[in-house]
C-alpha cells in the first residue's frame, strides 16, 4: 500500500500575481522517489525512506524532504592553531651522537632544559602551547623545532594568531641575542649563537564558515551566508528571521527555491496580499490598496 | 637514573682544606658534566668548579687558586680540593652532575643533584 502522507492547503499568492492553492512543496524540485519493501514514500531531493518517515539530507526538510531549511548547522572547531617551525643554535650544549636518539638520556635532558628555556621566553604569549623538537643536529646543537600555538575560534582567529606568531619571532630574536656565551661559559639557562635563528615556516589552521556554508547548502549555495552572534557564525537563508539579511515577507511566507528567496502571499476572508514582500493589501470588497 | 652521595664536608679553620667526594651510581663518568655549587645562607646556589667529559672546566673567580676539580672515573668519584678556607667559603657544598657536555654555571641546567654537604670555615 501507498504510504500517504497529510499535506494542508493553503491558498497563497506569489509575489508574480498568480494565485495557487498548494501545500508548502517548492514544485521547481525534482521529485525522486524512495521505495523500501512496500512502502512507497515521495522522498524528495536524495531523500529515503526509513520504515517510517524519510531523512532528509541536508539542506532539506519536511515530509517529503521538499521543503529547504532556513538555517544549516555550522560548526567551527573550538581552537584553531598555529605551527611555527624554528631553528634555533644552542651554544651552552655541545653536540654528541646521543642526541640523535630520542630516546636517550641525553635528549630527554637537552628536551627538558630547553622546553623549561622556552617556556620563559614565551611565557607572555596567551596562545603559547609548547614546544616540540623535530631534530637536533652538529653546530654546536642545531634544534629544529617546532612551536605551537593555539586560541579560541573566533571571527577574528587568524589576526590573532599572526599576532602571536610576530610576537614569537621577536621573543626568540630577543633570547637569541641576549643569552651568549662569555668566554666559553654561558650564566643562562642556555645560550645561543645570534645568527642561528631561523624561521623556516608557518601553518595556520584553515577554517572557512562561508565555505562550510556554502558547501553544505548545496544548489542553494548563492543564497545562503554567514551572519555572526556572539562571536559564532550562522548558515542562514533569508528566510531564517532575526537576522540582518533576513526577508521580511510581511502578510505572507518565506520560501526557498532554487531561485533564491521568495514570498508566498496569504489571502485572507477580508483581503489579498500582493507585492514582492506581500506588503500590497488588497481589500476584497473595496479594491483599494492599504500601502 | 643518577645518583649522587656527597661526603667530606666538616668545620675548618680559615687557611684549612678539606676535600670533597661525591660518589655516582652507574656507569656515567665517560660522558657528560660534572661540577660543584654551594649555597650560602640566604643566597642562591652558584657555580663553583665544572667539568665536562670534552675537556672543559670552569672556577669561580672567588676560587681560582685555590680550589681544584678532579674525577677519578675508576671510582665513579668526583672530588673538590679546597685549599686556604675562607670564612666566606662557608655554605652547603652540592655535586651535580649531566649526561651533556655542557658549558653553563646556572644551576637549572644540571639534571642531577646530590643532597649536599655543609662546610663551615670559622676559628
Known amino acids: 500500500p501507498l504510504a500517504t502522507i497529510p499535506v494542508s492547503t493553503t491558498s497563497l499568492t506569489s509575489s508574480e500575481g498568480s494565485t495557487i492553492s498548494t501545500p508548502s512543496v517548492d514544485i521547481s524540485t525534482p521529485v525522486t522517489t524512495s521505495i523500501v519493501g512496500d512502502q512507497c514514500s515521495r522522498c524528495k531531493n536524495g531523500g529515503f525512506w526509513d520504515g517510517l518517515k524519510c531523512q532528509c539530507l541536508t539542506p532539506y526538510y519536511g515530509e517529503s524532504c521538499e521543503e529547504v531549511v532556513n538555517s544549516i548547522d555550522i560548526a567551527p572547531p573550538e581552537t584553531v592553531s598555529a605551527q611555527m617551525e624554528l631553528t634555533v643554535t644552542v651554544t651552552s650544549v655541545k653536540f654528541t651522537d646521543e642526541l640523535k636518539n630520542h630516546s636517550s638520556q641525553e635528549f630527554r635532558e637537552f628536551n627538558k632544559t630547553f622546553t623549561e628555556q622556552m617556556n620563559i621566553v614565551y611565557s607572555g604569549i596567551p596562545e603559547y602551547v609548547g614546544v616540540n623538537i623535530t631534530n637536533l643536529r652538529l653546530g654546536s646543537v642545531v634544534v629544529e623545532h617546532d612551536v605551537l600555538l593555539r586560541t579560541k575560534y573566533t571571527p577574528e582567529y587568524k589576526t590573532a594568531l599572526d599576532n602571536a606568531t610576530e610576537v614569537v619571532k621577536q621573543k626568540i630574536t630577543k633570547v637569541t641575542t641576549e643569552q651568549i656565551m662569555t668566554n666559553d661559559n654561558c650564566s643562562a639557562l642556555m645560550c645561543f649563537n645570534t645568527t642561528g635563528t631561523q624561521v623556516q615556516n608557518i601553518t595556520v589552521t584553515q577554517y572557512d564558515p562561508v565555505e562550510e556554508c556554502r558547501q553544505k547548502a548545496e544548489e542553494y549555495e548563492d543564497y545562503f551566508l554567514v551572519e555572526y552572534r556572539d562571536q559564532k557564525p550562522y548558515c542562514i537563508s533569508p528566510c531564517e528571521s532575526g537576522f540582518n539579511a533576513s526577508k521580511n515577507c510581511n502578510h505572507g511566507k518565506c520560501q526557498m527555491s532554487q531561485n533564491g528567496a521568495r514570498c508566498l502571499c496569504v489571502t485572507t476572508e477580508t483581503h489579498w496580499y500582493s507585492g514582492e514582500d506581500c506588503n500590497q493589501g488588497t481589500q476584497k470588497s473595496h479594491h483599494h490598496h492599504h500601502h | 637514573e643518577v645518583q649522587l652521595v656527597e661526603s667530606g664536608g666538616g668545620v675548618v679553620q680559615p687557611g684549612g682544606s678539606l676535600r670533597l667526594s661525591c660518589a655516582a651510581s652507574?656507569?656515567?663518568?665517560?660522558?657528560?658534566?660534572w661540577g660543584w655549587f654551594r649555597q650560602a645562607p640566604g643566597k642562591e646556589r652558584e657555580a663553583v668548579a665544572l667539568i665536562s667529559s670534552d675537556g672543559w672546566t670552569f672556577y669561580a673567580d672567588s676560587v681560582k687558586g685555590r680550589f681544584t676539580i678532579s674525577q677519578d672515573n675508576t671510582k665513579n668519584t668526583l672530588y673538590l680540593q679546597m685549599n686556604s678556607l675562607r670564612a666566606e667559603d662557608t655554605a652547603v657544598y652540592y655535586c651535580a652532575a649531566s649526561v651533556l657536555v655542557l658549558r653553563t654555571l646556572n644551576p637549572k641546567a644540571w639534571h642531577h643533584w646530590g643532597q649536599g654537604t655543609m662546610v663551615t670555615v670559622s676559628s
Open positions: 652507574g656507569d656515567t663518568f665517560s660522558r657528560g658534566s
